[in-house]
């Protein structure tokens, strides 16, 4: 499978809401055997391969944010802990996954990456990522709600671990 | 803040076995993958194989296979690693360490270690 | 397998010196390269995962670089609590393989 984001670019004003979306392509398996890891964390475009650093996205960490669940079952985040910070991930059962952050502020700005590691019962792992900018604008230039941009390239960087 | 604590140093007799305990406080046990790490005196370290609480079935390294034996109970939130047929070459440190997501990413936690002294 | 070769085994260093220790991997393993910092009678600590990212906490003057087959763990300015024996670890797939160790001595 692969991640497809359907977004690259997320312009936002200030004190608004945005949802990051990220999807799964491809044939997911719902066996006993496998489960799923979602996660979200902030990060720079590397030289060698962007999404590799894992920065806290609002001081939660990617293992805060993670989802895990068998197949295309449905999750998200209730944790206390996320929507204290404005924050709740949630996935569908369509391969959709996305995280919700509240009330923006210009330090949201940067390079958010989404994560889905499948991980099946015989050690074997495949990661894949996707990655998208969100800018925060205050001011007269400030669109009045979010605008986003369409991905030209839907690909994602991925590994499997045997 | 995660803390794994393992279980006290041991000393065994050639041809026994060993079960070292490791209890995680502070985060979720279940998802996380929990590897064995072990390093003989004044050597490296050396992967003996992991387990990810929520599956129960663990992965040796092949070196190991048939010798050792990786469990968690979810319960206690406790992995444990037995190593049977022990010889003297097996006098390690035995380390467990908590992968950051799955089983290969990297591990951002460890244990304190425990020694097992093999000795007639 | 995936065989991780470090280089050099040992090496003596002043404090204030830029060190630089390598490591090679048999076959390409992408950015998953993770380096561990080793004192005597204590675990392991992580310092950069994903071959260039710093590790929570950990001080800036440890950086890494490198992809595919070839990677450098950097300490900028030796401080006296970097003497120490350092792993490097691929963690692209399972088993899990450690370079065999890179010990850094006061000179």
């Known amino acids: 499978f692969k991640v497809a984001t359907p977004y690259s670019l997320y312009v936002c004003p200030e004190g608004q809401n945005v949802t990051l979306t990220c999807r799964l392509l491809g044939p997911v398996d719902k066996g006993h055997d496998v489960t799923f890891y979602k996660t979200w964390y902030r990060s720079s475009r590397g030289e060698v391969q962007t999404c590799s650093e894992r920065r806290p996205i609002r001081n939660l960490t990617f293992q805060d944010l993670h989802l895990h669940h068998g197949g295309h079952q449905a999750a998200n985040t209730s944790h206390d802990l996320a929507q204290r910070h404005g924050l709740e991930s949630a996935s569908d059962h369509h391969g959709n996954f996305s995280i919700t952050m509240r009330n923006l502020t210009l330090l949201d700005s940067g390079l958010y990456c989404c994560l889905v590691v499948e991980i099946r019962h015989h050690h074997s792992e495949h990661r894949v990522h996707g990655a998208m900018e969100l800018q925060v604008q205050t001011g007269k230039d400030a669109p009045s709600n979010c605008v986003v941009y369409p991905s030209s390239s839907q690909d994602s960087e991925n590994i499997t671990a045997a | 803040q995660v803390q794994l604590v393992q279980s006290g140093a041991e000393v065994k007799k050639p041809g026994s076995s060993v079960k070292v305990s490791c209890k995680a406080s502070?985060?979720?046990?279940?998802?996380?993958?929990i590897s064995w790490v072990r390093q003989a005196p004044g050597q490296g370290l050396e992967w003996m194989g992991g387990i990810i609480p929520i599956f129960g079935t663990a992965n040796y390294a092949q070196k190991f296979q048939g010798r050792v034996t990786i469990t968690a109970d979810e319960s206690t939130s406790t992995a444990y690693m037995e190593l049977s047929s022990l010889r003297s070459e097996d006098t390690a440190v035995y380390y467990c360490?908590?992968?950051?997501?799955?089983?290969?990413?990297?591990?951002?936690?460890w244990g304190q270690g425990t020694l097992v002294t093999v000795s007639s | 397998d995936i065989q991780m070769t470090q280089s050099p085994s040992s090496l003596s260093a002043s404090v204030g010196d830029r060190v630089t220790i390598t490591c090679r991997a048999s076959q390409s393993i992408s950015s998953y390269l993770n380096w561990y910092q080793q004192k005597p009678g204590k675990a392991p600590k992580l310092l950069i995962y994903?071959?260039?990212s710093l590790q929570s906490g950990v001080p800036s003057r440890f950086s890494g670089s490198g992809s595919g087959t070839d990677f450098t763990l950097t300490i900028s300015s030796l401080q006296p609590e970097d003497f120490a024996t350092y792993y490097c670890q691929q963690s692209y797939s399972t088993p899990l393989t450690f370079g065999q160790g890179t010990k850094v001595e006061i000179k």
């Open positions: 360490a908590r992968h950051v997501l799955g089983w290969v990413l990297e591990l951002d936690y």
């Open positions: 994903a071959a260039s």
């Open positions: 502070g985060g979720t046990f279940s998802s996380y993958a």
